[in-house]
């Protein structure tokens, strides 16, 4: 588990915002992925497939994605965050078969804004 | 998992710092405890008691921490995280026996500084 | 257990319109692509269209050329096939299937359409 | 559009019989590991029930009697030994690309 999340960068810098990466194994074809804030679904993307082969993306919650053969990656606003949140994806493999459902990595983010960045706030108009 | 995790803040601020906590249950008297970043032993804590009932406290990477009955808290200073790192309690059990060795909580961090500081921190001579 | 019930056919004369609708029970209808699948008298199986999980898209079969088409209401679990401009060759029996990620893994009994002056 | 085609296009058989029913796409239906091929049987008077997916993966509750094989264009159904009440008609089906096609059919007759 610490080798498989230790090599896995999570989260990353994305213009300003957090990316928040969901690995998955290539092989999966059809799925859902949702990206939990503690207890609460931020966002919930899902991919399948019709009976041409045509995919359909449905992202209800309309967050900002990237979906490659093999990760799903979330983009945030800096929210606050000061007392840190928990993130977890969680994934649903349709296909293939059996259904499947797992929880993924999982990891907290710190949104930290430095002592001497609060001082020079107060200096601000 | 989630649940678990989610009410357990691995992480918080303390001091312009990051404080981690390790919880471990209120039955266990005699103890290592181990964080890890990434694959690296970060700190590592142990507690022991004597014939006395004498209790001893080895602390052999000095890092700054707070023990109490039930938990083990290791102060960091904000390394560049940006790239975020995965950190890991490791619990070694001695008493009550019989010996156990658990990874305990785990959480990727990624200590994120906003934007607006950053642009202050350039105005700066 | 998953149930698919066809209703809406019977004779209509050539160039006329029809309605048909599919009810579905036993699964979360709104979870997945449903299609169409037709059958002529003594014939084999036709695939007629399909549509996606929010009916946001649709495909259809060539034979189609803009004269049918599939929506559905997932507050009411109904899947629809309107037919325009029929033809004699429109003559069928026209399944509600659910396609099942990876195979139409349920059918309904069929509504037989007949295209007759 | 992809063109399935199905023999024998009809076989009489008898209770016991080991029976091999053929499919041959137009193109290829290997996508990553998987083949994009089912079968179904369709009895008379009944709408068609699944039997096979991913050309060898058998669906819940067929039998084990059913085997489907092959890969790329060429694919088989097997019955390791024919029943009765196996009679009626068999498709194979395509889901490579829009449209999903479906062969010929194969019907199973008593001898």
């Known amino acids: 588990e610490l080798n498989d999340l230790a090599n896995h960068r999570m989260f990353s810098f994305h213009d300003g915002g957090v990316q928040i990466s969901c690995n998955y194994p290539e092989t999966v074809q059809q799925l859902k992925m949702q990206l939990f804030k503690d207890r609460e679904v931020l966002c919930d993307l899902t991919k399948t497939k019709g009976s041409g082969n045509t995919v359909s993306i449905k992202n209800p919650m309309s967050c900002p994605y990237q979906l490659s053969n093999n990760s799903v990656s979330f983009f945030l606003d800096n929210a606050d965050s000061s007392q840190g949140s928990y993130f977890l994806c969680s994934l649903s493999i349709f296909d293939p078969p059996p259904f499947q459902e797992k929880n993924l990595s999982g990891g907290y983010l710190l949104i930290y804004e430095s002592q001497l960045c609060c001082q020079l706030k107060l200096w601000l108009p | 998992e989630l649940n678990d995790l989610a009410n357990h803040r691995m992480f918080s601020f303390h001091d312009g710092g990051v404080q981690i906590s390790c919880n471990y249950p209120e039955t266990v008297q005699q103890l290592k405890m181990q964080l890890f970043k990434d694959r690296e032993v970060l700190c590592d804590l142990t507690k022991t008691k004597g014939s006395g009932n004498t209790v001893s406290i080895k602390n052999p990477m000095s890092c700054p921490y707070q023990l109490s009955n039930n938990s083990v808290s290791f102060f960091l200073d904000n390394a560049d995280s940006s790239q975020g790192s995965y950190f890991l309690c490791s619990l070694s059990i001695f008493d009550p026996p019989p010996f156990q060795e658990k990874n305990l909580s785990g959480g990727y961090l990624l200590i994120y500084e906003s934007q607006l500081c950053c642009q202050l921190k350039l105005w700066l001579p | 257990e998953v149930q698919l019930v066809e209703s809406g056919g019977g004779l209509v004369k050539p160039g006329g319109s029809l309605t048909l609708s599919c009810a579905a029970s036993g699964f979360t209808f709104s979870d997945y692509w449903m299609d169409w699948v037709r059958q002529g008298p003594g014939k084999g199986l036709e695939w007629v269209g399909n549509i996606d999980e929010d009916g946001s898209t649709t495909y259809y079969a060539p034979f189609v050329k803009g004269r049918f088409t599939i929506s559905r209401d997932n507050a009411k679990k109904t899947l629809y096939l309107q037919m325009n401009s029929v033809k004699s060759e429109d003559t069928a029996t026209y399944y509600c299937?659910?396609?099942?990620?990876?195979?139409?893994?349920?059918w309904g009994q069929g509504t037989l359409v007949t295209v007759s002056s | 559009d992809i063109v399935m085609t199905q023999s024998p296009s009809s076989l009489a058989v008898s209770p016991g019989d080991k029976v091999t029913i053929n499919c041959k796409s137009s193109?290829?239906?290997?996508?990553?590991?998987?083949?994009?091929l089912a079968w179904y049987q369709q009895k008379t008077g009944q709408a068609p029930k699944l039997l096979i997916f991913?050309?060898?993966t058998r669906h819940t509750g067929v039998p084990d009697r059913f085997m489907g094989s092959g890969s790329g264009t060429d694919f088989s159904l097997t019955i390791n030994s024919f029943q009765t009440e196996d009679l009626g008609d068999y498709y194979c089906q395509h889901h490579y690309s829009t449209p999903p096609t479906f062969g010929p059919g194969t019907k199973l007759e008593i001898k």
């Open positions: 193109q290829s239906l290997l996508s990553g590991n998987y083949n994009y």
């Open positions: 991913y050309a060898s």
């Open positions: 299937t659910r396609w099942g990620r990876y195979a139409f893994d349920s």
